[in-house]
Interface confidence: low
Amino acid sequence: EDLKKVFPPKVAVFEPSEAEISHTQKATLVCLATGFYPDHVELSWWVNGKEVHSGVSTDPQPLKEQPALEDSRYSLSSRLRVSATFWHNPRNHFRCQVQFYGLSEDDEWTEDRDKPITQKISAEAWGRADC
Amino acid sequence: PYIQNPDPAVYQLRGSKSNDTSVCLFTDFDSVMNVSQSKDSDVHITDKTVLDMRSMDFKSNGAVAWSNKSDFACTSAFKDSVIPADTFFPSPESSC
C-alpha cells in the first residue's frame, strides 16, 4: 500500500445538547473520526480512565466521505449516552480514542496532551457543573 | 429491537473545541423508521444503530449527520427521511 494514501483520523467529541438533557434526562456525546485512509480503525470510549461499553453505539463500518471515489477517505461516528446527572458531574471525564492501523504495525495513535494541537487522535470532554 | 417509548428528536451538538463541523443527532425513534442517506455529498449521515444503556434498561435508535458546510442546519439534515416537524429541538443561543 502506497504510503501517500495513509491519512490518520481527526477526532472530535461533541457535547450533549441541553435540549436533549432537559427533554429526556439523558445526555448523548458524539465522537467523530474523520478523514482517514485506509479504513482500519477501532474506536473506544473511556470514562474516568476506564473503557466503557454500556451506553455505547458505534457505526458497524466506516462511511466513505466521497462514495464516488475509489480511494475516498473514511469517517466513523460513535455515541455515548449517560444520565443527565452523570454528565453534569464536573468530576466525570469522557474521552473518545481511535486506534488507526494504516502502517505495517498496529499503532495506537494517542496524542500527547501537553500542548494544544489541532489534530488529536483522542478527544475529550468534561462534565458540566454550571448547567 | 423493540423501542418501548419512541420519542423521536433531532438535537444539535457542539464540539468541545473550536470546530467547523456541525453535528446533528437523530435519536429515540421507532425501529420501523429508516434513515436515508443524504443526496448532498457534503453532508454525511450514518446508518441507524442501537444503543443499550444496560444500567437503565433502556435502548434507543440513533443516527448522526454532520457537515462542514457553513449553512448546514439540523432542520434539513434528515430531510430525505420521514421525520415529524415537531422533532427538531433548536440549540439555545447562549452556550451553557
Epitope: L3, V6, P8, L103, S104, E105, D107, E108, W109, T110, E111, D112, I117, T118, Q119, K120, I121 | -
Partner: nanobody
C-alpha cells in the same frame, strides 16, 4: 517534532554506486516508518523505498534489485544503498518519516544525486 537530514549525494558515473544517509533527531521514538523518495527535474516526487520499524521493506519497481533500504536504530539513521546507477536516477532524493503523533509526516531537505558520464 522530528528533524531529518540527508547526506551522501553527489556525482557518479553510470554503473556506479552511492550510499545515502538520513539522520533523524527529535521525537524519533514516535516514528514508525521511513521512506526514500526522489524528484527529477520537471517530474513529480516518487517513491523509491520504504522501511517500517519492523524492518519490512517495499521498493518501487525502478529500484528493485539495484537499491537497498536499511536502518540503524542505534544511530537513528536510515540508508539507501544505490548500485548500478543510471542517468535516469538523477534526482533530488528526500527522506521521509511518519510519526505516531501530529503532524505525522516529516520530510528532509533532500540530497542531490547526479548520474552522468
Amino acid at each position: 517534532e522530528v528533524q531529518l537530514v540527508e547526506s551522501g549525494g553527489g556525482v557518479v558515473q553510470p554503473g556506479g554506486s552511492l550510499r545515502l544517509s538520513c539522520v533523524a533527531s527529535g521525537a524519533v521514538h514516535k516514528i514508525n516508518f521511513y521512506g526514500w523518495y526522489r524528484q527529477a527535474p520537471g517530474k513529480e516526487r516518487e517513491k523509491v523505498a520504504h522501511i517500517s520499524i519492523g524492518d519490512q521493506t517495499d521498493y518501487a519497481d525502478s529500484a528493485k534489485g539495484r537499491f537497498t533500504i536499511s536502518r540503524d536504530e542505534s544511530k537513528n539513521t536510515v540508508y539507501l544503498q544505490m548500485n548500478s546507477l543510471r542517468p535516469e536516477d538523477t534526482a533530488l532524493y528526500y527522506c521521509r518519516a511518519l510519526s505516531r503523533i501530529w503532524p505525522y509526516d516529516y520530510w528532509g531537505q533532500g540530497t542531490l544525486v547526479t548520474v552522468s558520464s
